[in-house]
């Protein structure tokens, strides 16, 4: 049987939520008029072909928007991008689509998202508010890589 994506809401430890602004995901403080995106996540169905003990390999999409998070090199550096893509199309591919995959690790209530295509690079938000989501190698410094997930519906 085919799985269905799980809708979740994500915020960081500073209670900032993800919002879509001009096709870019940014992290902003949760306020009355802020409408956070709902993230869809689904596990890769080829988990046996990926690294063990690194976390659960997942695809991350924006619920109802046909946009998925992916990692691609810009010059020498991996960058986080949004691409027009149906998350179920990625899920059903005959091989893992690594550029769109993240190892999801949970420790207590905290979650991290490590790029499968670029091991050691994690989804992060700058410690300052209102900044785009990025990929970083530097954990727990100027960037926050720990997020809280709340399952919806």
């Amino acid at each position: 049987k085919s799985e269905m994506p799980q809708p979740v809401s994500i915020q960081d430890i500073n209670h900032r939520v993800w919002v879509l602004q001009d096709q870019i995901l940014i992290a902003v403080p949760r306020k009355d008029r802020v409408s956070p995106v709902t993230i869809s996540l689904i596990s890769c169905r080829h988990v046996e072909t990926l690294e063990k003990d690194r976390g659960n390999p997942i695809y991350l999409g924006l619920n109802g928007l046909n946009l998925c998070l992916m990692c691609a090199k810009a010059g020498d550096q991996p960058t986080l991008q949004l691409k027009e893509k149906d998350i179920m199309d990625l899920y059903n591919q005959p091989e893992p689509v690594k550029s769109f995959l993240f190892y999801h690790s949970q420790s207590g209530r905290n979650s991290t998202f490590e790029s499968v295509a670029f091991p050691g690079w994690f989804i992060a938000v700058s410690s300052e508010g209102g900044c785009p989501l990025i990929l970083t190698q530097e954990l727990g410094k100027a960037n926050t890589t720990d997020f809280g997930l709340t399952m919806l519906f």
Partner: antibody, heavy 121, light 109 residues
């Protein structure tokens, strides 16, 4: 320019093993999947298996499980196919191919020119 | 294991449209089989044409298109050219393994 350079023809005795190589240039094998395919005269193509060179995980067609072993050396950008307990049935041309995701699908976009293996006493 | 069957040979003329098909022994071919089409020319020269049933590989001429026709995968060459004379293989995914067809020898004369 992307190229897959395969090792030269091999003549080996029944019961022996052989290791074929496929060296990539113009791209990093860590960024893709490397497939191996067998072609016997007048018998079409058979999928042997594939390796993800970045992490070394493999998949094999059940028919080649135990016969073929796929490995990769990312430092030399080379994928390898080892065949063991050779018989005349293993006489064939063996191809490596890149199976890559681009835009919306996976494709066999580049192929080596094949290595001819002859098993004979 | 599934068997994938193709026409053994087809002949067409330059400028004509020709369709090659790919049948599965397990039933109808669907998008879940992610049909691939590969061209073989003399001297072991292989080129990937189509992936995921209907997606042309980068750099492949627009005259090549992939589709599902009835219960089979199909490769259509619209306006065949003499350089399209080759053997064409389809490959279908079944869960975690790939099965190739026996190939269709296409003659363009």
């Amino acid at each position: 320019e992307v190229q897959l350079q395969q090792s030269g023809a091999e003549l080996v005795k029944p019961g022996a093993s052989v290791k074929l190589s496929c060296t990539a240039s113009g791209f990093n094998i860590k960024d893709t999947y490397m497939y191996w395919v067998k072609q016997r005269p007048e018998q079409g193509l058979e999928w042997i298996g594939r390796i993800d060179p970045a992490i070394g995980t493999t998949r094999y067609d059940p028919k080649f499980q135990g016969k073929a072993t796929l490995t990769a050396d990312t430092s030399s950008n080379t994928a390898f196919l080892q065949l063991s307990s050779l018989t005349s049935e293993d006489t064939a041309v063996y191809y490596c191919a890149r199976y890559d995701y681009s835009g919306s699908s996976f494709y066999f976009d580049y192929w080596g020119r094949g290595t001819t293996l002859t098993v004979s006493s | 294991q599934a068997v994938v069957t193709q026409e053994s040979a087809l002949t067409t003329s330059p400028g004509e449209t020709v369709t090659l098909t790919c049948r599965s022994s397990t039933g109808a071919v669907t998008t879940s089989n992610y049909a691939n089409w590969v061209q073989e020319k003399p001297d072991h020269l292989f080129t990937g044409l189509i992936g995921g049933t209907n997606n042309r590989a980068p750099g492949v001429p627009a005259r090549f298109s992939g589709s599902l026709i009835g219960d089979k995968a199909a490769l259509t060459i619209t306006g065949a050219q003499t350089e399209d004379e080759a053997i064409y293989f389809c490959a279908l995914w079944y869960s975690n393994h790939l099965v190739f067809g026996g190939g269709t020898k296409l003659t363009v004369l």
